[in-house]
């Protein structure tokens, strides 16, 4: 038998300091996890203790922090290489600043191979990226060899800006051909790494001939065997066994997100490469765990440049932006729509020549609006100002739901209405009408929303079972504010881009923004 | 640091048998594929077969298939390409290669080959 | 079998200038497609895989490109030390093909 450990990461998205608990900024150092400094304190203990080591990464690397606007990807390449990653799979998110942003700072900087066998690049961009990501990889560990064959979520082109010269082929499909290639070149141990959520990885094990873990992202699924660690609740055991179509056991792994826990699995093979056992558990990377010094030194090194950018000018505004609570708690306010509307331009993807765009709505908690920003200070607005309203460093991502579902979140929106509580809804796309003079849930008198498949958009009522995709805050998806509906009955939801990122970079294009209050939302007369 | 060390420069007759070797270190010989690639003199490179140590499965081009024989011994990490009856035609440099996945990554310094009367 | 054709068969170029070799394959090999460097009395050396991947320690002055069936092989600025002959080689199907080489000389 021969014991293969395998080290992996998911979803680390731009998280290369250290965080808080819940992986924002961390404040309280003692109580802070994670981080690049810290990871590789861990990776080396393990790998200076075990013979046969791979440290994978499963993608979406890119996209959530300052480090990453700032970056741009390039601090990516920079600290993987010092980590001394073996191998990577392309995630939905490497293709947020489009396919130059992908090869520029990571492929062409990467020391380990970028993998994913179901993109296919064609036209003039296949010349161009040929050869910089692969799909697979045979990769010496000890005296064997290990198979890596990757993937990524074939919904990327309506969640990021890969272009129409990449084309997302289903996985399985794309799989089973290099799985077979590799078994043509005897290698009779193969992980199939890559970033297509959990419910694909699961399906991948189950059906691709010849696949003997798969290590897995995109969903943040926390697998956990015994007491979990943290506040994380797990979805399953880790590893989760799947029985193959051919009666093989697979484990299926993935690791949260944001570079809190290090994944950690320890495969046993027999000679003929079958698994004969799997085990293993995430390991949280707390404050027990020392941040290594040398890698510390060069965060703080790149760090500089970061500072300098929270304080210069994205863009102006010409009109005050009320990102008040006695505003945006009780009413529509600009700065609500102002967020919606650079949430929906982030977007903009013409992947279909029936529909204008995929998505025409969005929804804020009122709540999650933090502050103004004064238009007296000569109109600038800085990454620094946007921080003071968005503070929670959260992603806007992108959900399914049915018109039911929305109905529900407006009702929710204001059934206690007047107590300046967060969860009052500012939108795009939407025209809401309440009357509060009726009793709670049964509020919303008037849900008109933007139409998506139509050349010349206009306002439609809400059909109840109707499935849309609307563009909402990570908090709202996960159930915040009291939005339970939302979390039980999404039809799918892929996590997006940071909130301060997708505003900043909204202004930085405007140049010059003065959003207005436009009758999005409206009370029926002799109700408020 | 990956090697593959061949056997010395041979000088034979037509119709002589011959074995020469490949002994590889530094990585995982059993679990690569060993290459053997021809190059008779002032001409180009020729692929003429490989062998998986660990398995002993190989493969031949068309025109290599009935001439040589490929085997390895993964006990001491060597491969062989070896000629039952050889012919002047023979003469040549002959290279081995490691191949792990796309490409043959490290080769050999070269075994010369002279067959003649 | 795949037929793998080079041009040209051999070059002379000044020091610092750009060379571009290409290679054509019979058939559709995708993207599996290598470059070696033979100096004169040496064995070959690998230096870029899958079309466009420099092996460790090969130079950034060669890269490769290309797709299906036509690829090019192109160093940015020719030295002295890179007086050899250049293979492209199929790695798409059995049996492994080389092209017949392409001689660089320096003017």
């Known amino acids: 038998a021969w014991e293969l450990t395998i080290l992996h990461t998911n979803d680390v998205h731009s998280r290369l300091e250290q965080t808080s608990e819940d992986s924002s900024k961390c404040v309280n150092a003692s109580r802070c996890m994670g981080g690049v400094a810290r990871l590789f304190t861990k990776v080396q203990q393990i790998r200076r203790a075990e013979p046969n080591v791979l440290l994978l990464d499963a993608g979406d690397q890119y996209q959530g922090t300052i480090w990453f606007t700032v970056y741009k990807g390039a601090e990516v390449a920079h600290f993987m290489n010092a980590l001394r990653y073996d191998a990577m799979a392309l995630g939905n998110h490497e293709f947020d600043n489009g396919v130059e942003g992908l090869i520029e700072p990571l492929l062409k900087e990467a020391k380990f191979p970028i993998l994913s066998a179901n993109i296919k690049a064609k036209g003039p961009l296949a010349s161009q990226i040929s050869g910089l990501y692969l799909p697979y990889k045979v990769l010496p560990v000890g005296d064997e060899v290990v198979g890596i064959v990757g993937y990524t979520s074939k919904e990327t082109p309506f969640l990021s800006n890969p272009g129409t010269n990449l084309v997302f082929e289903d996985e399985i499909t794309a799989l089973q051909p290099e799985v077979d290639k590799l078994k043509t070149l005897n290698v009779n141990k193969i992980i199939a790494l890559g970033h297509s959520g959990f419910e694909m990885d699961k399906l991948i094990a189950q059906k691709v001939r010849g696949v003997d873990v798969v290590v897995g992202g995109h969903s943040n699924t926390f697998l956990y065997t015994g007491n979990p660690p943290s506040k994380e609740v797990p979805a399953g055991k880790y590893p989760f066994i799947v029985t193959s179509d051919d009666g093989r056991k697979v484990p299926v792994v993935q690791a949260y997100a944001f570079g809190k826990y290090l994944g950690y699995l320890k495969i046993e093979f027999d000679e003929r490469g079958n698994v004969i056992s799997s085990h293993g558990n995430p390991i949280l990377l707390n404050s027990s765990i020392p941040e290594d010094p040398s890698i510390k030194a060069d965060i703080n090194k790149w760090r500089i440049k970061l500072d300098n950018y929270s304080t210069q000018e994205l863009g102006k505004t010409i009109v005050y932006l009320d990102g008040s609570s006695q505003s945006c708690r009780f009413r529509e306010c600009n700065m609500g729509n102002l967020i919606c509307d650079a949430m929906i331009n982030n977007n903009l993807r013409h992947t279909d020549e029936m529909f204008w765009n995929h998505v025409s709505m969005c929804i804020l908690n009122g709540g999650g609006i933090r502050s103004p920003i004064d238009e007296r200070n000569n109109g600038t607005i800085t990454w620094e100002n946007l921080a003071a309203v968005l503070p929670f460093g959260g992603t806007f991502d992108l959900v399914q739901l049915k018109g039911s579902t929305l109905k529900k979140a407006f009702e929710h929106s204001v059934h206690r209405y007047g107590q300046s509580t967060g969860e009052f809804l500012q939108v795009g796309g939407i025209h809401v009408v309440y009357d509060l003079s009726r009793k709670p849930g049964d509020r919303v008198v008037k849900l008109d929303v933007l139409c998506t498949k139509c050349r010349v958009p206009s306002y439609d009522p809400l059909k109840m079972d109707e499935v849309y995709k609307v563009i909402l805050p990570n908090f709202l998806a996960n159930g915040g504010d009291g939005f339970q509906m939302i979390k039980d009955e999404l039809l799918r939801h892929d996590s997006g881009d940071q909130d301060i990122n997708v505003v900043s970079t909204y202004i930085s294009k405007m140049k010059v923004i003065y959003p207005a209050v436009e009758g999005r939302i409206k009370f029926s007369t002799g109700s408020h | 640091e990956v090697q593959l060390v061949q056997s010395g420069a041979e000088v034979k007759k037509p119709g002589e048998s011959l074995k020469i070797s490949c002994k590889a270190s530094g990585y995982a010989f059993s679990s690569s594929w060993i290459n053997w690639v021809r190059q008779m003199p002032g001409k180009g490179l020729e692929w003429m077969g490989r062998?998986?140590?660990?398995?002993?499965?190989?493969n031949y081009a068309g025109k290599f298939k009935d001439q040589v024989t490929i085997s390895a011994d993964k006990s001491i990490s060597t491969a062989y390409l070896q000629w039952s009856s050889l012919k002047a035609s023979d003469t040549a440099m002959y290279y081995c290669a490691s191949l792990l996945d796309y490409s043959m990554d490290y080769w050999g310094q070269g075994t010369l080959v002279t067959v003649s009367s | 079998d795949i037929q793998m054709t080079q041009s040209p068969s051999s070059l002379s170029a000044s020091v610092g200038d750009r060379v571009t070799i290409t290679c054509r394959a019979s058939?559709?090999?995708?993207?599996?497609l290598n470059w070696y460097q033979q100096k004169p009395g040496k064995a070959p050396k690998l230096l870029i895989y899958y079309t466009s991947r420099l092996h460790s320690g090969v130079p950034s002055r060669f890269s490769g490109s290309g797709s299906g069936t036509d690829f090019t092989f192109t160093i940015s600025s020719l030295q002295p030390e890179d007086i050899a002959t250049y293979y492209c080689?199929?790695?798409?199907?059995?049996?492994?093909?080389f092209g017949q080489g392409t001689k660089v000389e320096i003017k």
């Open positions: 058939q559709d090999i995708s993207n599996y």
């Open positions: 062998i998986y140590p660990r398995a002993g499965d190989t």
């Open positions: 080689q199929q790695g798409n199907t059995l049996p492994l093909t």
